[in-house]
């Protein structure tokens, strides 16, 4: 063509992928008359027609471009649709009169890559390569042109370094056009690198400007060989008996080599390999005050068959031994004293508590209860706490029942039990007293006795109502060495002119829980003599 | 082995004043109630007081009653009788013994008794 | 209330006797019985429902039936010679009563 050198460069006209691209032709009306006018795309600098305009109206061209080709701007401008990477090249158009002008544009494609992926060498790097290894693979996949991409170390570039750092990269073209950049970072990495975080970063343009994009961040496995084993106790502060204890190896290299646990023998003072679970973890659970001791680690190199051993740990499982009463069943008089002592042992100090076991009350913070002039009331349930203050929940306690001897004490002395005739009866009687009484009742019935506490004994009593049996009532006598005490049940008969029973009478159950009767605690007190009495 | 040893007898004159004493060995004193029990020559026994094993409660027999004070000392294992305004009819052997349950139930060992003689 | 005791009571050698002891408080109480021997402290051979102490052979027994509290020894020794008495509390819980004594002959 003539004078083409020229020609003037041609005008930039950037899009994106799947756009439009508006291709002006900047003839003026000088240079050719706008209705009549020839559109070119030039490839490998061959002219192919594809649109042609006359009168101001528009024809595509069979061929690539046919159904994607308008016209704008009262014919000054030609639209292309769905702007594909192969639409990259130069548009030009052609005036015919008065004489042939052209015009050229230069489209330029731009797509985005998607989100660049990272995936690291899951074989991992060995510290101790004599080339890089391979770290990591970064793809950037369906961009336009191809992105560049940049390594990054801790948010450091990298860049290229002889022997230590090498950046290989490729790229394929899709058949869409579109390219996927793959990008392999290769590296010799140190023992501090096993924290290193690495990321691929894609830079790329649009019409918009300059872009980027990151991927993830990702460790490498990395694989040095352990110079320290050590062992580690979960959880941490004191333990106690009961406790789950773990006791784990733990390295400093990667892998970790192959670890066994030993506990010295107190007596033999040998090492004695302990059994662990499929981790290597020897799990202690529940710890008993046995398990403490001395314990170490070793770890074995499988590779070069290297041993390592760790610096011994003690480990103390605290604990309190079973609780001692002494006496451990005592038995005393009335108005006598007592003297409960406790014992126990422990890996700590030790506090001791008495309480009331029927009230939880706390009597006395001490490992010995005195108890002076024994009333029948104090019978019963003592329970020492052997505790260590200072580690919550190492505890354990012994319960001891004391006894006073006394004859039966009756629930209640007499009771009015409503009834119907012919019905079956549940009568019981209550009792307590030190030996326990045996109960006895003065009618026929299914009686069953039932021992309440060491010293308290329930007799329950099933009875057919006659009237031989509402004339007399039914007496229930307890007795033990010391003693005979009876009560009374009156049986009363329920009718429409009798009144809703109150509270205090049952149908049923005829047990009361009634305090019993205290006496004044003085220092010497004249006294009637104690009596086998009743309460009710 | 148990043992009750009584002393402290002797004649008094009517409206004078004795000190029993018993002295208990092999066994846990505290922890026993203790009685006096009497017997006037040639007649039955005849109990004339109690005391709980801490000491913390008495019992009379009603002759005796604002005559006579029981007592106990548990540090020394040794139980009293204080016998003021003594009478002709509290002549007797004095035994001291222990209750095998709580005061009173059944006394289960005895010592061998200390004569008291009330005679002018 | 009393505890009442016959004054004496005989029996023949190897023949079994009963001492009895009535009064109302034997109703709540049991009976202790003790036996003396002339010049010496009385000693325990009942107490309770019906125990012994040690050192008191079998052939001593004891029973309570209504008011009434009863010592039996089978196969009487001339040992068994003594005073008998009966002791428990009065049924208002006031006096501690002694039986007034039953003397056994073994004849």
């Known amino acids: 063509v003539p004078g083409e050198a020229e020609q003037p460069a041609p005008e930039l006209v950037e899009v994106e992928v799947g756009s439009t691209a508006l291709l002006k032709c900047g003839l003026s009306q000088s240079q050719g008359n706008l209705s009549h006018v020839d559109w070119f795309s030039v490839h490998k600098e061959k002219r192919t027609l594809i649109f042609r305009v006359r009168q101001g109206q528009g024809q595509s061209e069979p061929g690539e471009y046919e159904q994607r080709l308008s016209l704008q701007d009262r014919g000054a401008t030609l639209a292309l649709t769905q702007v594909t990477p192969q639409d990259e090249r130069i548009f030009l158009c052609q005036g015919k009169r008065p004489r042939s002008q052209e015009y050229r544009i230069q489209l330029r494609v731009y797509k985005a890559p998607e989100e660049p992926n990272i995936q690291v060498n899951p074989l991992g790097i060995p510290v101790n390569s004599k080339e890089p290894e391979e770290v990591a693979t970064c793809v950037g996949r369906n961009g336009y042109p191809i992105p560049q991409v940049i390594w990054y170390k801790n948010g450091r570039p990298l860049k290229e370094e002889k022997n230590r750092v090498h950046i290989q990269s490729s790229q394929t073209v899709e058949s869409s056009g579109l390219y996927t950049l793959q990008s392999i970072l290769k590296a010799q990495l140190v023992k501090e690198d096993k924290d290193a975080q690495f990321y691929c970063e894609l830079n790329y343009r649009l019409p918009s400007g300059n872009h980027m994009k990151e991927s993830r961040e990702v460790t490498v496995p990395v694989f040095y060989p352990t110079e320290k084993v050590w062992l580690e106790v979960e959880p941490v502060g004191m333990l106690k008996e009961g406790d789950r204890v773990e006791i784990r190896c733990l390295a400093d290299g990667n892998p970790p080599p192959h670890f066994s646990i030993s506990k010295q023998n107190p007596s033999t003072r040998e090492a004695e390999e302990e059994t662990t679970n499929d981790n290597g973890v020897l799990v202690l659970e529940p710890a008993r005050k046995e398990h403490s001791g001395r314990y170490e680690c070793q770890g074995l190199d499988l590779d070069t068959m290297i041993s390592l051993l760790s610096e011994p740990q003690e480990l103390l499982v605290n604990y309190v031994s079973d609780v001692r009463v002494s006496p451990a069943a005592p038995e005393r008089q009335e108005g006598s004293s007592l003297t409960l002592t406790c014992e126990a042992e422990s890996s700590q100090d030790l506090e001791f508590q008495w309480l009331r076991e029927e009230t939880g009350q706390v009597l006395e913070r001490g490992p010995v209860l005195q108890l002076h002039d024994l009333k029948r009331e104090a019978g019963g349930g003592y329970r020492c706490v052997a505790s260590v203050p200072s580690i919550p929940g190492l505890n354990r306690t012994q319960l001891v029942n004391v006894a006073i001897f006394g004859p039966p004490w009756m629930a209640f002395k007499e009771r009015k039990v409503w009834v119907k005739e012919n019905m079956v009866l549940n009568l019981s009687c209550e009792a307590s007293g030190h030996p326990r009484p045996t109960i006895s009742w003065n009618v026929n019935g299914t009686a069953s006795e039932q021992d309440q506490d060491p010293q308290r004994v329930l007799s329950t009593l099933n009875v057919l109502v006659t009237p031989e049996l509402l004339e007399t009532g039914v007496e229930c006598t307890a007795s033990n060495d010391l003693g005979k005490n009876t009560s009374i049940l009156f049986l009363e008969l329920v009718n429409l002119t009798t009144l809703t029973p109150d509270s205090n009478t049952t149908t049923g159950l005829s047990t009361s829980t009634a305090s019993p009767h205290t006496r004044a605690n003085s220092t010497s007190t004249e006294r009637k003599l104690p009596e086998p009495e009743s309460r009710g | 082995e148990v043992q009750l040893l009584e002393s402290g007898g002797g004649l008094v004159q009517p409206g004078g004043s004795l000190r029993l004493s018993c002295a208990a060995s092999g066994f846990t004193f505290s922890s026993y109630a203790m009685s006096w029990v009497r017997q006037a020559p040639g007649k039955g026994l005849e109990w004339v007081s109690a005391i709980s094993g801490s000491g913390g409660s008495t019992y009379y027999v009603d002759s005796v009653k604002g005559r006579f004070t029981i007592s106990r000392d548990n540090s020394k294992n040794t139980l009293y009788l204080q016998m003021n305004s003594l009478r002709a009819e509290d002549t007797a052997v004095y035994y001291c013994?222990?209750?095998?349950?709580?005061?009173?139930?059944?006394?289960?060992?005895w010592g061998q008794g200390t004569t008291v003689t009330v005679s002018s | 209330s009393e505890l009442t005791q016959d004054p004496a009571v005989s029996v023949a050698l190897g023949q079994t006797v009963r001492i009895t002891c009535q009064g109302d408080?034997?109703?709540?109480?049991?009976a202790s019985w003790y036996q003396q021997k002339p010049g010496q402290a009385p000693v325990l051979v009942i107490y309770?429902?019906?125990k012994r102490p040690s050192g008191i052979p079998d052939r001593f027994s004891g029973s309570t039936s209504g008011d009434t509290a009863s010592l039996s020894i089978t196969g009487a020794l001339a040992d068994d010679e003594a005073d008998y008495y009966c002791h428990s509390r009065d049924s208002s819980g006031d006096q501690i009563l002694f039986g007034g004594g039953t003397k056994l002959t073994v004849l």
């Open positions: 013994a222990r209750d095998i349950w709580g005061v009173t139930t059944a006394f289960d060992y």
């Open positions: 309770g429902k019906n």
């Open positions: 408080s034997l109703r709540s109480y049991y």
